[in-house]
């Protein structure tokens, strides 16, 4: 009878030990299985979860615009006063709804190439007005012409055309015209076949971004989605030195197993450069734990504050010998037009940049850019890309419309907020397929280990107690 009990207790302890050992073994084995599955599923090739979402994003992406309506155009043109602006918006468009095209796998170098078609659909229900709303903004062609032709002879010619077309420093344009293009009356007088259509994003609809060539991750998962080349080149040819490099991914995803200590590098064709984000906080997105990576102020700093940025300072006059910060001259990427990119409302920009403009209210929460990355898969499940488009206008003695200016202005035209969040259905699916499975496996591991240890300890104590009792 005593033997039966003892044998039972030992058997229970052995089962507990086996469960505990199995739970313990399951931890690295399970992690290995998860890693293997993740590695298999994030590869960019036909049949994987990642590929399906990569070809056509399952997220609805909106681009909201706020236009800076100039309140005192005549005063600025006549007296070189501060420019008073009032932002109007949001005007919302649905973007990135088109699938990637010309997808070509290269098994030799483990890359996949594609183009991303551009398209924008106006969303009246998410906008404060219509595409026909009018705004007083800088005359893009008048401001750009003397910058492109810094030649006094040609400026005299251009002045004749500007006067003839009754153009001036500022103009009134509809939202649709300003964003997507209008026939400029001044440029229309140039007697040579030049493009006379002007718009902040012209041309956009029916154009493509790319060709992008990215690593598919088949041979090395730590390179998945990293851009190998853009438009057939590994460099941009816009910046000197390492600033010209195409680094990282396109920000839609990153190689899996993202750590908080990691700097996420990505390339954005909108700003004609590679940039980076650093870990900000852990957040819960529809029940999925994600890491929020934010663009640090350091990325927009002057070379004095961040020496790494020295090669993004390509001109010395407007930048006050590279001491100004928070604006990026992307003219080389825009056919020489004086386009400057910044954060909205000149967030993180030096006071000299925003001083000539009245009506700006920078706000970290509203105007910063962030990426919410699910750390196991590296997928960006939510993002907010915020940037401002500005045009430099300088005094030009030979152009009457600009001759009264006493200083250069970096004039804000508009700012945009491009956002995307994983849908509820997709989030549930993601939880079921990824985080749910990982959680379940973790729970099974802990349960086995816990139950096993408790059983082993309990049965061993009982066995020992029985033995001592019998010994007496």
């Amino acid at each position: 009878m005593g033997c039966d009990r003892n044998c039972g207790l030992i058997a229970g302890a052995v089962i507990g030990a086996v469960l505990a050992v199995f739970g313990g073994i399951l931890m690295p084995v399970g992690d290995m299985l998860i890693e293997k599955t993740i590695k298999r599923e994030v590869v960019l090739e036909e049949g994987t979860t990642a590929f399906k979402n990569w070809v056509k994003t399952g997220t609805t992406v909106y681009r909201q615009f706020w236009i800076f309506d100039v309140q005192n155009p005549d005063d600025v043109a006549k007296n070189s006063s501060k420019i008073k602006v009032k932002q109007r918006g949001p005007y919302t468009y649905r973007v990135r709804y088109l699938a990637k095209e010309n997808i070509t796998q290269d098994p030799e170098d483990h890359t996949v190439s594609f183009v991303q078609p551009n398209g924008a659909i106006f969303e009246p229900s998410l906008s404060v007005g219509t595409e026909d709303d009018n705004f007083t903004v800088l005359n893009l062609a008048v401001a750009a012409a003397p910058h492109i032709y810094q030649n006094s002879f040609v400026q005299v010619v251009l002045n004749s055309l500007i006067k003839k077309s009754k153009s001036s420093m500022f103009q009134t344009r509809s939202l649709k015209e300003l964003l997507w293009g209008y026939k400029d009356p001044f440029l229309s007088l140039v007697p040579y076949p030049i493009s006379t259509t002007v718009g902040v994003f012209y041309p956009y609809n029916d154009t493509v971004d790319g060709v992008y060539k990215v690593f598919n991750g088949k041979d090395n998962i730590s390179k998945v989605a990293i851009i190998e080349s853009y438009k057939g080149k590994r460099n941009l040819s816009y910046w000197p030195s390492y600033c010209d490099m195409i680094n990282g991914t396109d920000a839609a995803s990153f190689p899996p197993f993202v750590e908080k200590s990691r700097t996420l590098r990505f390339f954005s064709s909108d700003i004609c450069r590679s940039i980076y984000a650093v870990f900000g906080s852990e957040i819960d997105l529809k029940g999925i734990p994600v890491y929020r990576f934010v663009l640090p102020a350091n990325a927009f700093a002057s070379p004095l504050q961040n020496p790494d940025n020295h090669c993004f300072c390509t001109e010395k006059v407007i930048s006050n010998n590279c001491t100004s910060y928070g604006v990026l001259d992307i003219g080389k990427c825009k056919e020489g037009k004086p386009v400057y990119i910044s954060l909205p409302h000149f967030l993180h920009a030096s006071p000299d940049v925003s001083e000539p403009i009245e009506g700006l209210h920078p706000n970290e929460d509203e105007h910063r850019t962030y990426l919410d990355v699910e750390p196991i898969t590296g997928f960006t499940l939510q993002f907010a890309k915020r940037l401002q488009v500005n045009i430099l206008v300088k005094p030009a003695r030979k152009i009457e419309a600009l001759k009264n200016l006493k200083r250069p202005y970096i004039v804000p035209i508009l700012w945009l907020n491009e956002t995307g969040t994983i849908g509820d259905e997709k989030a549930e699916m993601f939880k079921t397929q990824v985080t749910g499975k990982i959680k379940l496996l973790g729970m099974v591991e802990m349960a086995l280990l816990g139950i096993g240890v408790v059983m082993f300890v309990a049965f061993m104590i009982s066995y020992c107690a029985c033995k001592s009792k019998n010994g007496k």
Partner: antibody
């Protein structure tokens, strides 16, 4: 086809006046602006005057300022160079030329102006 | 005014020779330089604008280079019809100014 044809040259006494014409075809002179360039016998080219597009400003070489006047009649698509107080050193072949960005892509055949007593 | 100094003022060359004419501006004119060819009794003809841009219909043996203050016109292989006088011109600032010319003669 773009063509420029000068006329009005000839022999004139010092202190005299002459009006040169430049008839254009194949393009609108007001869109481009017209220049006059001269070449003294055996010498190089010298820019003389310019009328900017759309009847814009007029510009002159220092050597002719106050004596020469450039004008255009858009209805006739013709440019003119009114030359007063002519001097011996104004003797030259006068060309009219089309330009927009400052280089001359089309030239007339030239008309000879001789200032001599 | 911007002075344009051409050199040499004349040169003798044979058919097939490579000929180089230089032009120096008295101040920076960026790439706003044009080159012309003129034959006796004729109007000048545009060869090159913006220092390097070959005008339509001009043979590819003509090429231009330079930026700032120093510019060059090169004829890679001289042809019989190339014997003429060549002028450079800056189209950066008014008054527009020409070089004094380079006469290319048969050796």
């Amino acid at each position: 086809e773009v063509q420029l044809v000068e006329s009005g040259g000839g022999l004139v006494q010092p202190g005299g006046s002459l009006r040169l014409s430049c008839a254009a075809s194949g393009f609108t002179i007001s869109s481009f602006g017209i220049h006059w360039v001269r070449q003294a016998p055996g010498k190089g080219l010298e820019w003389v005057a310019w009328i900017a597009p759309y009847g814009g400003e007029t510009y002159y070489a220092d050597s002719v300022k106050g004596r020469f006047t450039i004008s255009a009649d858009t209805s006739k698509n013709t440019a003119y160079l009114q030359m007063n107080s002519l001097r011996a050193e104004d003797t030259a072949v006068y060309y009219c030329a089309r330009s927009f960005f400052g280089y001359f892509d089309y030239w007339g055949q030239g008309t000879l102006v001789t200032v001599s007593s | 005014d911007i002075q344009m100094t051409q050199s040499p003022s004349s040169l003798s060359a044979s058919v097939g020779d490579r000929v180089t004419i230089t032009c120096r501006a008295s101040q920076d004119v960026s790439n706003w330089v044009a080159w012309y060819q003129q034959k006796p009794g004729k109007a000048p003809k545009l060869l090159i604008s913006y220092a390097t841009s070959l005008y339509s219909g001009v043979p590819s043996r003509f090429s231009g280079s330079g930026s700032g203050t120093d510019f060059t016109l090169t004829i890679s292989s001289l042809q019989p019809e190339d014997f003429a006088t060549y002028y450079c011109q800056q189209h950066s600032n008014a008054p527009l100014t020409f070089g004094q010319g380079t006469k290319v003669e048969i050796k």
